[in-house]
């Protein structure tokens, strides 16, 4: 709590401006008037202010608006919505998608804050949807943000943005949202020659089809162990042993670390050991020679 | 290209003047606060005096309080620290400084330029 | 407020990870900046507001921490890292600067 103490002469703000810029702490809470702050929130952003100057200018929002803040003076914020508590957050109605993108584009180059997950849950409960605008705002700023999207949230995520999405921003989803985002990178990157793409759409492979999984094997894309063992275990399954070394290229010699866990120990039980033992790895647990393989679930599916 | 070159640094005795100039290009001068920091030798950095960015206010640390000026002509795109009463423990690099438009930190720094205050 | 950092000196080799400590006399919320500064060139902004990576600073570089304790860590340490680190405060006037921590090699 700041002391109540008197503006001394001359030193009374008749505006917001940088002769503010120097004010003690006791001198801005007693010659900035909070009305006046309110109307001219714009200007702030143009004064380089300490974090306890801009804490006693909060303090006088505070007391003007103590049911929560105008969506007026939201948008013109700017750094001071760094001193923004969620409790804070809470208490605004935010409607606007330019204020949306003004808070955002403040807090630009930080990691995705409780503040900023609060005012996003305050606006999409706003706006009463979670429409394409929005999701394009918030994709463009936080790519992470597809995670924690639920899949039929995902499904209105619009192509061009995954663009933006970094390989790390995917290593929160789980293979549901792959399955919807992989069809839209690949939508998205379906221009670029084979080299490229494969660094473009290796991130959301852990929702691509036994068919892509097969064509890829085609364009000696030698993908990694760790791209490998994100893939879909139902999609790996059918994949040929040739294939598998296709696709992993040199890579392929990492298998044998790998033999006990998912998908790789999935796959060799369902390879006749005769061509595994072809990669020359050691990888035991496939089909004896000799043993008659019956899918049953084709069987199924002609019955 | 965004950019601050010092000069006028140079050896004085104790009790002389000097006057640093900080010729900025490459952004617009009259947006930015500006500050001084020097670095004695072999020491750390000591925040010296800032300005606003019409000029119109200033700062200094205490020890230098009454001893050095800072000014700015925003037409010439210049900052300029007057010292004078000079001491042997103002002996030190003196560097210009472009503040962040948001608060205080420094997001652009001149070379520096050597200031000696020796007899 | 007064900064104090640690190590004063450290010896690491290339590809170490490196953690520099800042510690402040009072809470300063995350009003915080460091440097990076090499032998007779001027400091360059690494990162600022305690967390936030400078634009063109490479991401080996992160800041951590809130109040009075701050970390700056380089994941892998490169041969261009070598150099004196300070860390600065914001919070309120007079700025101060840490006492610097400078990185050599082993």
């Known amino acids: 709590e700041v002391e109540k103490t008197a503006c001394p002469s001359g030193k009374k703000a008749r505006e917001i401006d940088e002769s503010l810029i120097f004010y003690k702490k006791w001198e801005l809470e007693a010659c900035v008037d909070a009305a006046l702050l309110a109307t001219q929130m714009d200007r702030v952003n143009a004064i380089p202010f300490t974090y306890e100057q801009l804490d006693v200018l909060k303090h006088k929002l505070d007391e003007l608006y103590p049911q929560g803040y105008p969506e007026s003076v939201i948008q013109h914020l700017g750094y001071l919505f760094l001193k923004m508590s969620p409790e804070d957050i809470r208490k605004w109605n935010v409607t606007s998608l330019e204020t949306l993108k003004a808070l955002l584009e403040v807090n630009k180059g930080h990691e995705m804050s409780p503040q900023v997950a609060t005012l996003i849950d305050r606006f999409v409960k706003g706006r009463g949807q979670l429409d394409k605008d929005t999701l394009d705002t918030l994709t463009a700023f936080y790519p992470g943000y597809l995670c924690s999207l639920s899949p039929e949230e995902l499904s209105s995520v619009p192509p061009s943005s995954i663009w933006a999405v970094r390989p790390q921003d995917l290593d929160t989803c789980d293979p549901r949202q792959l399955d919807v985002l992989y069809p839209k990178a690949r939508l998205a990157f379906q221009n670029m020659n084979g080299s490229e793409y494969f660094v473009k759409i290796q991130s959301f492979l852990g929702g691509a089809p036994t068919e892509d999984l097969k064509a890829l094997s085609q364009q000696n894309v030698s993908m990694d162990l760790a791209t490998f063992m994100k893939l879909r275990t139902d999609a790996v399954l059918p994949l040929t042993v040739a294939e598998v070394q296709k696709l992993l290229g040199p890579h392929v010699e990492g298998l044998k670390a790998e033999e006990r866990h998912r998908p790789v120990r999935d796959w060799i039980l369902r390879q006749r050991q005769d061509d595994l033992d072809t990669l020359g790895l050691g990888l035991q647990g496939g089909i004896p020679n000799g043993y008659l393989v019956l899918d049953l679930s084709m069987q199924e599916a002609l019955s | 290209e965004v950019q601050l070159l010092e000069s006028g640094g140079g050896l004085v005795q104790p009790g002389g003047s000097l006057r640093l100039s900080c010729a900025a290009s490459g952004f617009t001068f009259s947006s930015y606060a500006m500050s001084w920091v020097r670095q004695a030798p072999g020491k750390g950095l000591e925040w010296v005096s800032a300005?606003?960015?019409?000029?119109?206010?200033?700062y200094y640390a205490d020890s230098v309080k009454g001893r050095f000026t800072i000014s700015r002509d925003n037409s010439k795109n210049t900052l300029y620290l007057q010292m004078n009463s000079l001491r042997a423990e103002d002996t030190a690099v003196y560097y210009c400084?472009?503040?962040?438009?948001?608060?205080?930190?420094?997001?652009?720094w001149g070379r520096g330029t050597l200031v000696t205050v020796s007899s | 407020i007064q900064l104090t950092q640690s190590p004063s000196s450290l010896s690491a080799s290339v590809g170490d990870r490196v953690t520099i400590t800042c510690r402040a006399s009072?809470?300063?919320?995350?009003?915080l900046a460091w440097y990076q500064q090499k032998p007779g060139k001027a400091p360059k902004l690494l990162i600022y507001d305690a967390s936030s990576l400078e634009s063109g600073v490479p991401s080996r570089f992160s800041g951590s921490g809130s109040g009075t304790d701050f970390t700056l860590t380089i994941s892998s340490l490169q041969p261009e890292d070598f150099a004196t680190y300070y860390c600065?405060?914001?919070?309120?006037?007079?700025?101060?600067f840490g006492g610097g921590t400078k990185v050599e090699i082993k």
């Open positions: 600065q405060q914001f919070n309120n006037y007079p700025l101060t």
């Open positions: 300005i606003s960015g019409s000029g119109g206010s200033t």
């Open positions: 400084a472009r503040t962040s438009r948001t608060t205080w930190y420094f997001d652009l």
């Open positions: 009072q809470g300063i919320s995350s009003a």
